[in-house]
Interface confidence: low
């Protein structure tokens, strides 16, 4: 007869791990017990369990209530034995001695493999500012048996670097991703991605980038200057920009205060009826925690009658 | 900077039962194992068991097995450390622990001390 | 279950050598960590896997492990290294966590 087994057995931490050893013998032949034992080098052999052919099983005390037999039906001639909730200290080989009538002992190893699936962290980087050089977005560690793998998912250009570390009975893999930040990146989700054979799927962890930065301003409502006269109403400047975070707006007048009646509604100034008085130079200052930026537009309102008398003027003059 | 807040002294009757907390912070909560050790006065340390903050799965000293309870709450990255049928040899003071992967505890709690008298 | 022995107490003058022992079967084949445990403090570890020093442990402490014994070993000892220590280990066999039993380091004069 011969012993069949497994040469490894994989399981993920927490799991019940089945150790495999049948019998394959001779009509006739039977197993009288099996025994089933640590053998590491270096730590010696070590009793498992005991399982016998008239009183069943016999586990060790370092593994009482951690070692069961697979629930029925049971063959006579198998040995394997459920070893619970595996561990990392689980791993290592084992040895299954078969002692049978009237065939004599056999022996066989096998090695259990217990995976440490990570557990992953992303750590963001420093605060990325437009015009920055090569930044650090983004760190992801991961801490596992054996070393998990960490790359990254994005859309956005960079650069990444890995390095690991070994501890004792797992390995750490941290891995930085670094960008020249630029606003176009704002938004954009950075995803790392862990990979390890204690994993179903894929653990994911998305950060999404934020890049400061101020555009500059400019004034919009002068587009037609004829649209300025005295008397018409709604008429309003609207400052225009764009920043992260998200800028705030002041407005001023260069050449005085602001004529009253005239509202500042956030990035709009809103005008009463126009007034000769409404003439001037007006500044928005729109600011963020990165910068700030002025734009300053000159208004001239223009009065018909004003317009008309000079016309009348000149023609009389004429 | 990482830290452990455990919560403060309690006082129990024998055949009581305790949960102390412990609050961690300054580190991803779900990427470290949390243990528990008790110190009795004058005595050494003496390990509880530990916790997967990440799954919850627990493994406990063979001494405290079927008294003792490790819960998280990832919600509030807290641990808790419940231990029942209390008697007088449990007056100790019950620290929480941080570690890697069952090897080294490279943080501790402040300590909670429980006092089990009638 | 795996027990690990250290000695009760070591004695040291300032600026000499301490040496504090942690026994147990095999222990060359296990990880040692070291603690640190001033009264009325948690411990601090002070040497992990054997030899390596955490951040912000001075230079003077270092440890070794072979055989059947662990060394902690404190170099130039100062009256703040005064404290109870600990050995502890991992022991696979039984998935537990053990500690020695502590050494009290007392500095003389």
């Known amino acids: 007869g011969e012993l069949e087994t497994s040469d490894v057995v994989t399981v993920v931490l927490g799991q019940d791990a089945k150790l495999p050893c049948f019998y394959r013998g001779d009509s006739g032949e039977q197993v009288g017990q099996v025994a089933w034992a640590r053998a590491d080098a270096g730590e010696g052999a070590q009793e498992l369990a005991l399982l016998h052919s008239k009183y069943g099983l016999h586990v060790s005390p370092a593994y009482e209530g951690r070692v069961e037999q697979p629930p029925p039906p049971r063959n006579p001639l198998d040995g394997s034995v459920l070893l619970r909730n595996a561990v990392q200290a689980d791993e290592g080989e084992y040895e299954c001695r078969v002692s049978t009538f009237p065939a004599g002992s056999f022996q066989a190893r096998l090695r259990l493999r217990v995976l440490v699936p990570p557990l992953p962290s992303l750590n963001p980087g420093p605060a990325l500012e437009e015009g920055q050089g090569l930044t650090l977005a983004a760190s992801c560690t991961a801490e596992g048996s054996p070393a998990p793998s960490v790359t990254w998912d994005t859309e956005v250009k960079g650069t990444t670097s890995s390095r690991s570390f070994k501890h004792s009975r797992s390995a750490a893999v941290t891995s930085e991703f670094h960008l020249v930040p630029s606003r176009s990146m704002n938004g954009q989700p950075l995803t790392c991605v862990v990979s390890h054979p204690g994993l179903l799927q894929d653990q994911r962890i998305t950060h999404i980038l934020h890049v400061s930065f101020l555009a500059e301003a400019s004034v919009r409502g002068l587009e037609d200057q004829n649209l300025w006269h005295v008397g018409r109403e709604g008429a309003m400047l609207k400052c225009l920009s764009e920043g992260q975070p998200p800028p705030s707006y002041n407005w001023t007048r260069l050449d005085g205060p602001l004529p009253s009646g005239v509202r500042v509604d956030g990035d709009t100034l809103g005008f009463p009826p126009l007034t000769t008085e409404h003439s001037g130079i007006y500044v928005c200052h729109v600011s963020n925690e990165f910068s700030s930026r002025d734009s300053q537009v000159t208004v001239d309102v223009l009065d018909p009658q004003e317009d008309s008398g000079k016309q009348v003027d000149l023609v009389s003059a004429s | 900077q990482v830290q452990l807040v455990q919560s403060g002294a309690e006082v129990k009757k024998p055949g009581a039962s305790v949960k102390v907390s412990c609050k961690a912070s300054g580190y991803t909560f779900t990427g470290y194992y949390m243990h528990w050790v008790r110190q009795a006065p004058g005595q050494g340390l003496e390990w509880m068991g530990i916790i997967n903050p990440s799954g919850g799965s627990t493994t406990y000293a063979q001494k405290f097995q079927g008294r003792v309870t490790m819960t998280r709450d990832t919600s509030t990255s807290t641990v808790y450390m419940e231990l029942s049928s209390l008697r007088s040899e449990d007056t100790a003071v019950y620290y929480c622990a941080r570690g890697r992967l069952g090897t080294y505890f490279d943080y501790w709690g402040q300590g909670t001390l429980v006092t089990v008298s009638s | 279950s795996y027990v690990l022995t250290q000695p009760p107490s070591v004695s040291v003058a300032p600026g000499q050598t301490a040496r504090i022992t942690c026994g147990g079967n095999n222990i060359g084949s296990k990880s040692v960590h070291w603690y640190q445990q001033k009264p009325g403090q948690a411990p601090v570890l002070v040497v992990y896997?054997?030899?390596d020093r955490p951040s912000g442990i001075p230079e003077r402490f270092s440890g070794s492990n072979s055989g059947n014994t662990a060394t902690l070993t404190i170099s130039r000892v100062e009256a703040g290294d005064e404290a109870d220590y600990y050995c502890?280990?991992?022991?696979?066999?039984?998935?537990?966590?053990?500690f020695g039993g502590g050494t009290k380091l007392t500095v003389l004069g």
């Open positions: 502890q280990v991992w022991d696979r066999s039984s998935d537990q966590v053990v």
């Open positions: 896997d054997d030899s």
